[in-house]
Interface confidence: medium
């Protein structure tokens, strides 16, 4: 599923991401935009043999199990394919673990490079939340 901007903002808010670990909803929507272009089925392969999955591009070396990533830790204890569902629950729950891990949203390269320090509130402007 490819979410609309405000549709995703509303879904993320429903799942408790607004101000989770101090990150406003705009940060999460911005991250999703630049990680996956709001596409729940996005997959991207990395040079280390791991793959990033879903709307927040969660990595198989650390967070989920795709059955083929050497030394996978599967810290979210889920199959990576669950992160590709049109229901973002699994992605959000795993993202909450990731953001609680110590580096905050710096874990997402796209957030670091494209969202951090910008007017992230623009990503939820005009949305009925």
């Amino acid at each position: 599923k490819v979410f609309g901007r405000c549709e995703l903002a509303a879904a993320m808010k429903r799942h408790g991401l607004d101000n989770y670990r101090g990150y406003s909803l705009g940060n999460w929507v911005c991250a999703a935009k630049f990680e996956s272009n709001f596409n729940t089925q996005a997959t991207n392969r990395n040079t280390d043999g791991s793959t990033d999955y879903g709307i927040l591009q969660i990595n198989s070396r650390w967070w989920c199990n795709d059955g083929r990533t050497p030394g996978s830790r599967n810290l979210c204890n889920i199959p990576c394919s669950a992160l590709l569902s049109s229901d973002i629950t699994a992605s959000v729950n795993c993202a909450k673990k990731i953001v609680s891990d110590g580096n905050g949203m710096n874990a997402w390269v796209a957030w670091r490079n494209r969202c951090k320090g910008t007017d992230v509130q623009a990503w939820i402007r005009g949305c009925r939340l």
Partner: antibody
């Protein structure tokens, strides 16, 4: 136990298309990548690409882009590979395998012969 | 693409001999190297994953070693059932690639 069952041998004419199937049993089909591998005598094993059935995400070896197309039907736990514009170079045994990085589980292979 | 070069192309041995098969990668692939045996008209069979981890049910006479670019599959005291083709495969990057194979034949 995990099993991959491929469709039977095919004899096709040049220019035609063929669709090979791979039915998976014994595991959660949607959560593992299915890989496709080509084997020709004297050419060894070549990786064609892969599909993640749960999402339909696909990756292709550049060499096979435009030649192979992957699909999957999670209701029947079956992956498919269509090969188009067949030539004699496509005559080979085609295997599906479960993509664990390594390949512990293979189909029995589908022999494709392209001949006029 | 990562190229895998296997040597020798053919190895003629007598049952009871011990042999080593080589697989060399064109760039470092850490330990992401796997070994297969294939007999005529059969699918490949995984022997060793991640350079040295023998799969369940594979006889202990098979062992793997190496890291980086140079890998070895050793068979201690070859048995008649071991004859066939042996392939290496890397999972360090895409596209996945295989070696050209080593044919183990009876002398």
């Amino acid at each position: 136990q995990v099993q991959l069952q491929e469709s039977g041998a095919e004899v096709m004419k040049p220019g035609a298309s063929v669709k090979i199937s791979c039915k998976a049993t014994g595991y959660t089909f949607s959560t593992y990548w299915i890989e496709w591998v080509k084997q020709r005598p004297g050419h060894g094993l070549e990786w064609i690409g892969e599909i993640l059935p749960g999402s339909g995400s696909t990756y292709y070896n550049e060499k096979f882009k435009g030649k192979a197309t992957f699909t999957a039907d999670t209701s029947s736990n079956t992956a498919y590979m269509q090969l188009s514009s067949l030539t004699s170079e496509d005559s080979a045994v085609y295997y599906c395998a479960r993509g664990d990085g390594w390949y512990c589980y293979w189909g029995q292979g589908t022999t494709l012969t392209v001949s006029s | 693409d990562i190229e895998l070069t296997q040597s020798p192309a053919t190895l003629s041995v007598t049952p009871g001999d011990s042999v080593s098969l080589s697989c060399r990668a064109s760039q470092s692939i850490s330990n992401n190297l796997h070994w297969y045996q294939q007999k005529p008209h059969e699918s490949p069979r995984l022997l060793i994953k991640y350079a040295s981890q023998r799969m369940s049910g594979i006889p202990s006479r098979f062992s793997g070693s190496g890291s980086g670019t140079d890998f070895t599959l050793s068979i201690n005291s070859v048995e008649t059932e071991d004859f066939g083709m042996y392939f290496c495969q890397q999972s360090n990057s895409w596209p996945r690639t295989f070696g050209g194979g080593t044919k183990l034949e009876i002398k």
